[in-house]
C-alpha cells in the first residue's frame, strides 16, 4: 500500500498527497483553543485505470461497468487522528482524540 | 454515520450506495472457484458541500481551497470482505477471506 | 507584533470598585485566554482568574470569587478586570497575560506576552 | 490549593558564577512548572515551560530540569542583566499558584 507526496512544485497529474496546513484561526474557529493550525494535507490529482488503487472492488467494479459509476476518484485512503482542546456546544472545555483529520496517504477508489 | 441506499429505478442524484453483482463468470475469472458472483454494490452521484461527508477534514479542505483540491467525490466509506476459493499463481488453492470487496456505505471525502 | 496594554495607574478609596483594561493587539483576540496575575508592592505574583474571549468563559481563584469579575469586549479587543469592595490589602501592580499554547493538552501552555501593569492604590 | 516552596528567597552571587534556584510543589504537579524573570518595575518573562522547554528567544545558559514535585532553574554563567527576581508557577491545577520568588543580586 503506497501513494504518491508531491508539493506546489510538482508536475505530477496523477492522484498524489500535497500539503496543507489548516489554520483555524483564520477560519475564525476559536472554539478550537489548540491546536490554533495543523498540517492536514489533501488529496488531488487523475485516476488512470488501476493507478493507486485501494481496493480490488474498485478494478471488479469498472469491468462491470454499471449505469452511473463516474470511474475512481482521488481521496484518502490512510488517514489520522489528531489530539484537539475545544469547547463544546455546552462551553465545557473537552479534550479528545479527533479522527480522520490528517491525510497520510491518497489513492483511487 | 449513515449512508443513503438507491436502486435502478431512484431519481436520487446525490451520491448514493446502488446495487451492483460481480459476475466473475461473464468476466472470465475461471481462477476463481468460488463464489461465481456475489453482490459488490457501488457508489454514485453527486457530493454537494457538507452532504454525507465522512470526514471532518473534507469540510477543512473545502474551507481552505487549496490550489487543485476537486472537492469530495462519492466513494465507499464503509467495505466489507467476502470469503472467496481461488487458484493463486503457484495454482495451489486458497480459501480466505478478501477484505473491501463489498460496498456496505457510501459517502463524500 | 502581539501586545497587551493596560489603563494607567488608579488611586481607590476603600470600598470603592476598579476596573483595569487591557488592549490586545497583533492577534486573534477571541481564541487566547487572557490571564490576570496581580502583586502587592514587595511581594510575590498571585493569580486572579482567566477568561476566553470568544465566549466569555471565565475561571477565578476562589479568593477573588466574590469579588472580582473578567469580562471583554470583543469589538475593541479589550479584556477588563472588575475588582470591588476594595481594601487597602488590594494595593498592587494588576497584570494581564495571554496564555500561548504550544502543545494541545489542557496544560501544555505559557504566558507568553505580559501587560506592562497597573498600579491600583487603595487608600482613604 | 498547590503551594510552590521555592527556595532561597535570596541570593548573592558574582558575574560568571552557575547558579541554581529550586522549587517544590506541595503535590506531583506532571512537570506543569514555569519559569519567570522580573526585573523591577516591568512586568514578569517567561523563560522556561513544561518544566526544561526554553522559550524562543531565551538564551541557553538558562535551563529547567525537574519532575513530580522538586523542580530547578540553572543560569549557567550569569551576566549583569540576569540580575532579577526569579519565580516558578505550576500550571497543573486551578488555581494557578506561584512560589514567592528569589532575588539575585550581585555580589
Known amino acids: 500500500d503506497f501513494g504518491l507526496d508531491c508539493d506546489e512544485h510538482s508536475t505530477e497529474s496523477r492522484c498524489c498527497r500535497y500539503p496543507l496546513t489548516v489554520d483555524f484561526e483564520a477560519f475564525g474557529w476559536d472554539w478550537i483553543i489548540a491546536p490554533k493550525r495543523y498540517k492536514a494535507n489533501y488529496c488531488s490529482g487523475e485516476c488512470e485505470f488501476v493507478f493507486l488503487q485501494k481496493y480490488p472492488h474498485t478494478h471488479l467494479v469498472h469491468q462491470a461497468n454499471p449505469r452511473g459509476s463516474a470511474g475512481p476518484c482521488c481521496t484518502p485512503t490512510k488517514m489520522s487522528p489528531i489530539n484537539m482542546l475545544y469547547f463544546n456546544g455546552k462551553e465545557q472545555i473537552i479534550y479528545g482524540k479527533i479522527p480522520a483529520m490528517v491525510v497520510d496517504r491518497c489513492g483511487c477508489s | 454515520d449513515f449512508g443513503l441506499d438507491c436502486d435502478e429505478h431512484s431519481t436520487e442524484s446525490r451520491c448514493c450506495r446502488y446495487p451492483l453483482t460481480v459476475d466473475f463468470e461473464a468476466f472470465g475469472w475461471d481462477w476463481i472457484i468460488a463464489p461465481k458472483r456475489y453482490k459488490a454494490n457501488y457508489c454514485s452521484g453527486e457530493c454537494e458541500f457538507v452532504f454525507l461527508q465522512k470526514y471532518p477534514h473534507t469540510h477543512l479542505v473545502h474551507q481552505a481551497n487549496p490550489r487543485g483540491s476537486a472537492g469530495p467525490c462519492c466513494t465507499p466509506t464503509k467495505m466489507s470482505p467476502i470469503n472467496m476459493l481461488y487458484f493463486n499463481g503457484k495454482e495451489q488453492i486458497i480459501y480466505g477471506k478478501i477484505p473491501a470487496m463489498v460496498v456496505d456505505r457510501c459517502g463524500c471525502s | 507584533q502581539v501586545q497587551l496594554v493596560q489603563s494607567g495607574a488608579e488611586v481607590k478609596k476603600p470600598g470603592a470598585s476598579v476596573k483595569v483594561s487591557c488592549k490586545a493587539s497583533?492577534?486573534?483576540?477571541?481564541?487566547?485566554?487572557m490571564h490576570w496575575v496581580r502583586q502587592a508592592p514587595g511581594q510575590g505574583l498571585e493569580w486572579i482568574g482567566n477568561i476566553y474571549p470568544y465566549n466569555g468563559v471565565s475561571n477565578y481563584n476562589q479568593r477573588f470569587k466574590a469579588r472580582a469579575t473578567l469580562t471583554v469586549d470583543k469589538s475593541t479587543s479589550t479584556a477588563y478586570m472588575e475588582l470591588r469592595s476594595l481594601r487597602s490589602d488590594d494595593t498592587a501592580v494588576y497584570y494581564c497575560?495571554?496564555?500561548?499554547?504550544?502543545?494541545?493538552?489542557?496544560?501544555?501552555?505559557?504566558?507568553?506576552?505580559w501587560g506592562q501593569g497597573t498600579l491600583v492604590t487603595v487608600s482613604s | 490549593d498547590i503551594q510552590m516552596t521555592q527556595s532561597p528567597s535570596s541570593l548573592s552571587a558574582s558575574v560568571g558564577d552557575r547558579v541554581t534556584i529550586t522549587c517544590k510543589a506541595s503535590q506531583d504537579i506532571n512537570s506543569y512548572l514555569s519559569w519567570f524573570q522580573q526585573k523591577p518595575g516591568k512586568a514578569p518573562k517567561s523563560l522556561i515551560y513544561?518544566?526544561?522547554r526554553l522559550v524562543d528567544g531565551v538564551p541557553s545558559k538558562f535551563s529547567g530540569s525537574g519532575s513530580g514535585q522538586d523542580y530547578t532553574l540553572t543560569i549557567s554563567s550569569l551576566q549583569p542583566e540576569d540580575f532579577a527576581t526569579y519565580y516558578c508557577?505550576?500550571?497543573?491545577?486551578?488555581?494557578?499558584?506561584f512560589g514567592q520568588g528569589t532575588k539575585l543580586e550581585i555580589k
Open positions: 513544561r518544566a526544561n
Open positions: 497583533g492577534y486573534s483576540f477571541t481564541g487566547y485566554f
Open positions: 508557577l505550576q500550571s497543573d491545577e486551578f488555581p494557578l499558584t
Open positions: 497575560a495571554r496564555r500561548y499554547y504550544y502543545g494541545t493538552g489542557p496544560a501544555d501552555w505559557y504566558y507568553d506576552v
